[in-house]
């Protein structure tokens, strides 16, 4: 595969990663698919410094990140360990709230208006952030 050495047009470089900030909304799964089609993933926040960078760019708007517990435990989409990693939940979150009346609980994480995280219904059409790492060889599957 070929290595990506600079960010694509309309993406923002920061600390050897590239970020793309949507300006419209999709459900979490659709946002996840969008990032994958860009050979990227929903943003994975690994430090307070990265949190501040993303928060600065998204402003006070609900925005999906690459964290969910749709299969039980909380997981980052790129395999980053959740338990030992950076977290920035709002107080008393995540709460898997069932009181919204939309069926089920809350399985997808988003940045709230103050940047701290909340779990919410994955079908809500929030903005999202894609991330891809520079110097990472793109995995091109062999042609059969």
């Amino acid at each position: 595969g070929s290595e990506r050495t600079c960010c694509p047009v309309n993406w923002v470089e920061h600390e050897r990663s590239c970020y793309w900030f949507s300006r419209s909304g999709k459900a979490w799964a659709d946002a996840d698919n969008y990032c994958r089609l860009e050979d990227a993933h929903l943003v994975v926040v690994t430090s307070w410094e990265e949190q501040k960078f993303v928060q600065h760019h998204i402003g006070p708007v609900n925005t999906w990140m690459g964290l969910h517990d749709q299969n039980g435990p909380w997981k980052w989409v790129d395999g980053t360990d959740y338990e030992t990693g950076f977290k920035n939940w709002r107080p008393e979150q995540p709460d898997d709230w069932y009181g919204h009346g939309l069926g089920g609980g809350e399985d997808c994480a988003h940045f709230t208006d103050d940047g701290r995280w909340n779990d919410d219904v994955c079908q809500r059409p929030y903005r999202w952030v894609c991330e891809t790492e520079l110097d990472k060889a793109s995995q091109e599957p062999p042609l059969l």
């Epitope: 595969g1 070929s2 799964a29 659709d30 698919n33 089609l37 860009e38 050979d39 995995q139 091109e140």
Partner: antibody, heavy 118, light 107 residues
């Protein structure tokens, strides 16, 4: 000039196989997600499949899942569609199309006809 | 799957007429909608993306509007080369789906 050129269509019997190709030029192929869209005779458009720029991610319409495989060779700027277990209802003109960042199809090939008949 | 319904299925109009085509989604798709023009024997051509953005090279007589579930393609003054079939496409979620098409014919 930005261009997509499909080839590989033809007449095939039900249950048979065919591989379509789409040669791209005039844009950065390796960073563009690519699609196949088909149109049965006298009918509307049906999206078939998409593949990310690296080839690492694919998605299919339910009507072709498990029978069709989308792939690409970025060294040759070429997109492929391997079609197996073909059915009469797969008869259509097959277009390759480039995806833009708003998930619309901004560049189209001229199409190649696939006829499935005994 | 998200279903897209266009109306009318065909329209007869004269050069210079204002033509409006509507597209309705059976669920909210925000602004994730595109419009295409197709002439017989040819590939579709992108006219409008993100509901209201005019594709580069497309005449300004074409415009798109709407969000949520209801969308409109307007041709402000029909030209001879505009007689064709028009399709909407939702890009909100997989599988991406098209409307059934609207044929604009000469009156």
């Amino acid at each position: 000039e930005v261009q997509l050129l499909e080839s590989g269509g033809g007449l095939v019997q039900p249950g048979g196989s065919l591989r379509l190709s789409c040669a791209a030029s005039g844009f950065t192929f390796s960073s563009s997600a690519m699609n196949w869209v088909r149109q049965a005779p006298g009918k509307g458009l049906e999206w078939v499949s998409v593949i990310s720029g690296s080839g690492g991610y694919t998605y299919y319409a339910d009507s072709v899942k498990g029978r069709f495989t989308i792939s690409r060779d970025n060294s040759k700027n070429t997109l492929y569609l391997q079609m197996n277990s073909l059915r009469a209802e797969d008869t259509a003109v097959y277009f390759c199309a480039k995806r833009n960042t708003d998930d619309a199809f901004d560049i189209w090939g001229q199409g190649t006809m696939v006829t499935v008949s005994s | 799957d998200i279903q897209m319904t266009q109306s009318p299925s065909s329209v007869s109009a004269s050069v210079g007429d204002r033509v409006t085509i509507t597209c309705r989604a059976n669920q909210d798709i925000s602004s994730w909608l595109a419009w295409y023009q197709q002439k017989p024997g040819k590939a579709p051509k992108l006219l409008i993306y993100a509901a209201s953005n005019l594709q580069s090279g497309v005449p300004s007589g074409f415009s798109g509007s709407g969000s949520g579930t209801d969308f409109t393609l307007t041709i402000s003054s029909l030209q001879p080369e505009d007689f064709a079939t028009y399709y909407c496409q939702q890009a909100n979620s997989f599988p991406w789906t098209f409307g059934q098409g609207t044929k604009v014919e000469i009156k």
